[in-house]
């Protein structure tokens, strides 16, 4: 028995093979900065962590996932502003007692240097120099990604 | 359509408080960051910070951090800007404004204004 | 904090005319500037957004340019309403700061 979510996933991977070739972001849309092969977007206003991933989602995007050390330094270039706190897609999972991605990937200690502690309800935020973990309560601004990499589906015959 | 209606004038002396009101109508208040922008007389604009009227959240200009509140009451569509300490130099028409993006930083309506006099 | 400086401060013209006012930045802003319009006694009018992109009701007379740190308000042909101040804005940082403004009188 599928759950509801899992049918939902079963779904839309059926409807994705049945698609044609969708062209990927070639280029940024306007507004948004292009970094390497993400297109990035500063919020203008302040949410908890929650809010702020549901805005992204507004926008056909996800909150800032960072790859790795180098990405985290370039990404930090962009951040004009030296006080000035924005949400990225990792928090704390109580029940893998690990930082997670909103991929569901987990965060390879090495990539991150985060100053703070590991602990329920709590969210990764970045400054200009600096990685946090904040209360996800908290109400700072954010950063929403588009990926820029062409995304090709196959075409599968029906089954 | 869209209209941001403030309180009146107010008149106060150096040391007290004021604050000042803006009803939105016209709109879904909670989706649209407000902000509060001054205007001395003849001089230009100042932004002073913004409110998030879904989440409460604020971000002040460090210039009024430690002297200005901005608040909100969903149930009434109002925000506040309530500024203490007030000083002559104080002196100014104070805006709210609408930002119409959340992810840019124009304010495509404006109140009325709200004139505050400090004067002893 | 980033600093505007709009030139000229005050310029006279007639209807018809073409004018242009000009706001620098102190520092490289990309393209988030904005431009308003105020009349005496009433809140600033949103005109344009990223450098060029006009408001909507705002006539095509009005026009904006530039990026980095020099950007220009185009009147194509002033018309009586036209007479007001206008300042420009940056959001480039999240200090909002404003030009000084230029008021536009008629000659």
């Known amino acids: 028995q599928k759950s509801s979510i899992e049918k939902c996933s079963v779904d839309i991977q059926q409807s994705r093979n049945k698609t044609t070739e969708r062209p990927g972001l070639l280029n940024c849309p306007i507004y948004w900065q292009q970094l390497r092969e993400k297109c990035l977007l500063f919020s203008h206003t302040v949410n908890p962590w929650n809010n702020s991933l549901a805005d992204c989602s507004t926008k056909e995007s996800s909150l800032l996932l960072i790859r790795d050390k180098d990405e985290l330094i370039h990404t930090q270039n962009l951040i004009r502003d030296k006080a000035i706190l924005f949400w990225i897609g990792l928090n704390f999972s109580l029940s893998e007692k690990n930082w997670k991605w909103i991929n569901g990937s987990f965060l390879n200690s090495n990539d991150l240097e985060i100053r703070g502690d590991a602990k329920e309800n709590s969210c990764i935020s970045i400054s200009q120099t600096s990685v946090y973990s904040e209360y996800c309560s908290t109400e700072i601004r954010w950063i929403c990604q588009k990926e820029l990499t062409p995304v090709r589906n196959k075409v599968y015959p029906d089954s | 359509q869209v209209q941001l209606v403030q309180s009146g004038a107010e008149v106060k002396k150096p040391g007290a408080s004021v604050k000042v009101s803006c009803k939105a109508s016209g709109y879904t208040f909670t989706g649209y960051t407000m902000n509060w922008v001054r205007q001395a007389p003849g001089q230009g604009l100042e932004w002073m910070g913004l409110?998030?009227?879904?989440?409460?959240?604020?971000y002040y200009n460090q210039k009024f951090k430690d002297r200005v509140t901005m608040t909100r009451d969903t149930s009434i569509s109002t925000a506040y800007m309530e500024l203490s300490r007030l000083r002559s130099d104080d002196t100014a028409v104070y805006y709210c404004?609408?930002?119409?993006?959340?992810?840019?930083?124009?304010?495509?309506?404006w109140g009325q204004g709200t004139t505050v006099t400090v004067s002893s | 904090d980033i600093q505007l400086t709009q030139s000229p401060s005050f310029l006279s013209a007639s209807v018809g005319d073409r004018v242009t006012i000009t706001c620098r930045a102190s520092q490289d802003v990309g393209s988030a500037v904005v431009w308003y319009q105020q009349k005496p006694g009433k809140a600033p009018k949103l005109l344009i957004d990223w450098a060029s992109i006009r408001h909507s009701g705002v006539p095509s007379r009005f026009s904006g340019s530039g990026s980095g740190t020099e950007f220009t308000l185009t009147i194509s042909s002033l018309q009586p309403e036209d007479f007001a101040t206008y300042y420009c804005q940056q959001y480039s940082t999240y200090l909002y700061t404003f030009g000084g403004g230029t008021k536009l009188e008629i000659k």
């Open positions: 404004a609408r930002l119409g993006d959340n992810y840019r930083g124009y304010f495509d309506y």
């Open positions: 409110i998030n009227p879904s989440s409460g959240g604020t």
